[in-house]
Every structure is written in C-alpha cells, then in structure tokens.
Amino acid sequence: QDSPPQILVHPQDQLFQGPGPARMSCQASGQPPPTIRWLLNGQPLSMVPPDPHHLLPDGTLLLLQPPARGHAHDGQALSTDLGVYTCEASNRLGTAVSRGARLSVAVLREDFQIQPRDMVAVVGEQFTLECGPPWGHPEPTVSWWKDGKPLALQPGRHTVSGGSLLMARAEKSDEGTYMCVATNSAGHRESRAARVSIQEPQDYTEPVELLAVRIQLENVTLLNPDPAEGPKPRPAVWLSWKVSGPAAPAQSYTALFRTQTAPGGQGAPWAEELLAGWQSAELGGLHWGQDYEFKVRPSSGRARGPDSNVLLLRLPEKV
C-alpha cells in the first residue's frame, strides 16, 4: 500500500576531520520508495563536479573535501562552521524533511589566553602554574609537560583545573621547565616554557618571646579620602595598637580584616596586609558600605605571635 515518506534515520552533527571523506546518513520509508535530495543551508546540492558532494544509492551523502565557506549564514561567524545539511525524501504522496545536521571543521587557534609564568616556590608550600589554552573546536584539553616530557600527575599532589596546574606541596624535584600543551582533533599548541625554581624554607627558630607578646588593637579610624585619587577613591583606615610583653620581639605586624556576615553566618576569610608601622599604620583597599572586622598579628620571620582583639567598623556607603 502506498504511503508518504517518513525519515527513519536523521543526519547527525559531524566534525570534518581531514583528509575525509565525511558521511551524512539519511534513511526514509515510503511507498513508492522515496528519492533523497540533500540541501546545504537550505540550498539544493548540485552533486555535479566540481561539487565535492556525492550521493550514494542508500541516500548517504559523501563529502570528499570541506565545501568552500560562502557567506556566514544564520549568525555564524566562525571558520569552524561549514553549514547545516538537511535531507528531503520525496515520493508522489509528499515530502519529508530531516532535522538539520551541522558540519564543522576542527580548529585550534594559536594564541594562549594565559601563558604560564616563571616562578619561585618554597618546599612544602603549594604553587600554581596558570594556563589558558587557545580557542578551539572541539574545545581543547590541556596537559602539562616538564623538562620536555609529559608530567606524571600524582593524585593528591597535582591537580589540573581549568587549565591551571596546582601543586599541593612543592618538592625540590619539582624544579624545572614547565609547558602547557593544548590539544584537539585539529592538532596541538605549546605554551611558552616557564621556569620553576624551588627554594628551601628559611631556617628559623621560633622566638619563644613572640608567643608572650600581647597586642591591644585600640583604634580603627576612617581616613578622609585623598582628592588626588579621583572621584571614587577606595576607603582607607588608620589602625593603632599597643604592644606589651618582651622588648620589641616582633619584626613586623600584619593587619587581618574581613567583611562581617550576618549573625550565625559563615565568616568571610580573613585578608592579610603587611603594615608599615610598629604602633600604627594605614590600611587601604577596603570597600564602601561594608561592616569590617580588624585585628593585628605580630611576626618575626616565619614565626607568628598571637592575634590582637577584634575591632569592628562600619564604612558608610560613600563619602
């Protein structure tokens, strides 16, 4: 019994990977058996040389080489996009049209968004090498190489996240030249080589007297904005504190500050800023309209003394 065409197998999105050919499938039912016709971006394909398309008896479209890209269609602007193919199955009772299948070509651009930088890390501490790969279709994967060989990632010690390499605990053996490699089906690109030097931690004996230091944070005062900083300067405060205990054991003082969250809420992490003073100092880089907590911590080399009391200050919306 005669029946109109129905598409049974729709063409699928494809990535053209040289040297080709690419195949687009289309199968249809119907009585009499329907004839298959292919369209590219809505235009029928001629199938006559030098057209690179070829129709097989079962309705499959063979693409021997990527078609020349005409004008960008349907808002497309990337050289990766070769067009949308649809097939039509027709008999005397009607025509069925398949879903559109996009044909694209693999591309890997040359410019890295972020190149890894030379750096110095300390034994036992963590460090990160950043890498932002070039744009690619399909999206490239990132791997890391050290001294010309693929880096063997050790679980718990190495993490690759968003292209960047995180080293949990630096070891002397981590010293060397690192390179980030972006790879997809179009090929691969290498970043610049970044030199990583690993230093031993500074030897120190923790000054026992530092533990006996007592810091009293006495005052936190909002400073008047400097007119030279333009129309919207960031607020700064003046911290003043008193030190009691052994005679001046601290080599430096650090301000710890954070925005206050709602009562019972998870506290924000403390930000740290080295202070340029031994009893008072300015602290900048704050934000208007926030409630802040401040405290001061003494330190000598890598040793840290106990934190001071905490003082609160509400910064107005803007001065």
């Epitope: 808002g75 602007a77 990337l78 040359e110 932002g132 744009w135 999206e139 292209g163």
Partner: antibody
Framework: EVQLVESGGGLVKPGGSLKLSCAAS????????MSWVRQTPEKRLEWVAT????????YYPDSVKGRFTISRDNAENTLYLQMSSLRSEDTAMYFC???????????WGHGTTLTVSS | DAVMTQTPLSLPVSLGDQASISCRSS???????????LNWYFQKPGQSPQLLIY???NRFSGVLDRFSGSGSGTDFTLKISRVEAEDFGVYFC?????????FGGGTKLEIK
C-alpha cells in the same frame, strides 16, 4: 539573527547574591566563547568574565575573582553569572556578549541592571 | 594590567569633518605570535555597544568605510573621515591581548 537576552538583575543588599542569565538564539551557541561585561553608572565599561565554548576554561579580573562564577548550559543555549558577596561597586548594567574565538566581542545583549545598596 | 587611556575625553566636531580618537596602552598589545587584539566599539545612549573595528584595522560587517583603525604596539587610532549625524555618541577601545581584558574610558563625539 543573533539574539542575546539578559535577565535576573535587581536590587540586592551588600553581601548578597544574585544569578544573571543570558538566553542566546540565532547561532550555534556551543561553538562560541561568551563573556559578561558591565557598565558602571559613570558609563565605564569593565570586563567581568569569559567562558570557553565548552565551558571548561573561565577567566576573571581580580575585582570579581572568587565572588563571581560564569557558567553555561549548551543544551539550553544559556549563559549564567552567579554573583556573591556583592558590593556597592558592583552596581552596573550587565551585558552578555558573544566572542569570536577570543579575538573580539561581536554581538551584545541589551543588558540587565544590578543595584547593590542597603 | 594593561591600562587603556583614551584621548580626548570629549571631541566636538561639525558634520562632514574628520574625527580622530586615540587609545594608548600601558604595555604593548602585540603578543608573542605577532597578533594584536585591539577593538573599537560605539555606543549610543540607552543602547548596547556595537563593534566597529576588530584586530586594530578590520571593519566589522556592515560598518561603513568612513571608519578606519590603525596603530601598533601601544598606540592606536580610530578615524572617522566624514562625520555624519548618526556617528555622535561614545567610542571605546578594548584590548583582549592580555588577561584581564581592559577598556578605555571612552571618548564622547559631540556636535560642535
């Protein structure tokens, strides 16, 4: 025709959170990197975030790093910007924009307004 | 960060005149592959920015040839050969060579 439509803006208190969305149509969303750009009340433009076509790679300026997260749903043709620990200086009109490779932003949405104030 | 400085802040011109806007970067925008990613945008009040010029000197589709971009390294220029009524608004430069991407402060082209 390329269309980008932002939504989700509003008034938020300092320290609060908000999620912006951008619905894309008229192009194959999954092959394009996307960005968020904001325009301050003083009309300065500031780049806020960029995400790669597949969503694996994200980039931010220091001013929003750790507070804002850009993401995308390629099946739904939607771009997102999750913002937390909002500050008064985040007050701006937020635009989503399409990227050609990582070379230039060619099409921009009409924007959605965020106001951070107590 | 690459700080982008646009001059002048405001540019009063008469219809038919030539206008020239400068954009200077605090560091070279040419990357290690010799590519320079400096783009120019135009914005009218209440509208979103529109791309005019990409990669220093390439006109975006539909942009008239009255607009031209030039420059290299740290110094870039946008020229409008014969200013027409629809050209009045604000022009921005944007560099995407270095992360973070940075915009110039804008130049307002206004009627003299």
């Amino acid at each position: 025709e390329v269309q980008l439509v932002e939504s989700g803006g509003g008034l938020v208190k300092p320290g609060g959170s908000l999620k912006l969305s951008c619905a894309a149509s008229g192009f194959t969303f999954s092959t394009y990197a996307m960005s968020w750009v904001r325009q301050t009340p003083e009309k300065r433009l500031e780049w806020v975030a960029t995400i790669s076509n597949g969503g694996t790679y994200t980039y931010y300026p220091d001013s929003v790093k750790g507070r804002f997260t850009i993401s995308r749903d390629n099946a739904e043709n939607t771009l997102y910007l999750q913002m937390s620990s909002l500050r008064s200086e985040d007050t701006a009109m937020y635009f989503c924009a399409r990227l050609i490779y990582y070379d230039y932003l060619d099409y921009w949405g009409h924007g959605t307004t965020l106001t951070v104030s107590s | 960060d690459a700080v982008m400085t646009q001059t002048p802040l405001s540019l009063p011109v008469s219809l038919g005149d030539q206008a020239s806007i400068s954009c200077r970067s605090s560091q070279s925008l040419e990357n290690s592959n010799g590519n320079t990613y400096l783009n120019w945008y135009f914005q009218k009040p209440g509208q979103s920015p529109q791309l005019l010029i990409y990669r220093v000197s390439n006109r975006f589709s539909g942009v008239l040839d009255r607009f031209s971009g030039s420059g290299s390294g740290t110094d870039f220029t946008l020229k409008i050969s014969r200013v027409e009524a629809e050209d009045f608004g604000v022009y921005f430069c944007l560099q995407v060579t270095h992360v973070p991407w940075t915009f110039g402060g804008g130049t307002k082209l206004e009627i003299k």
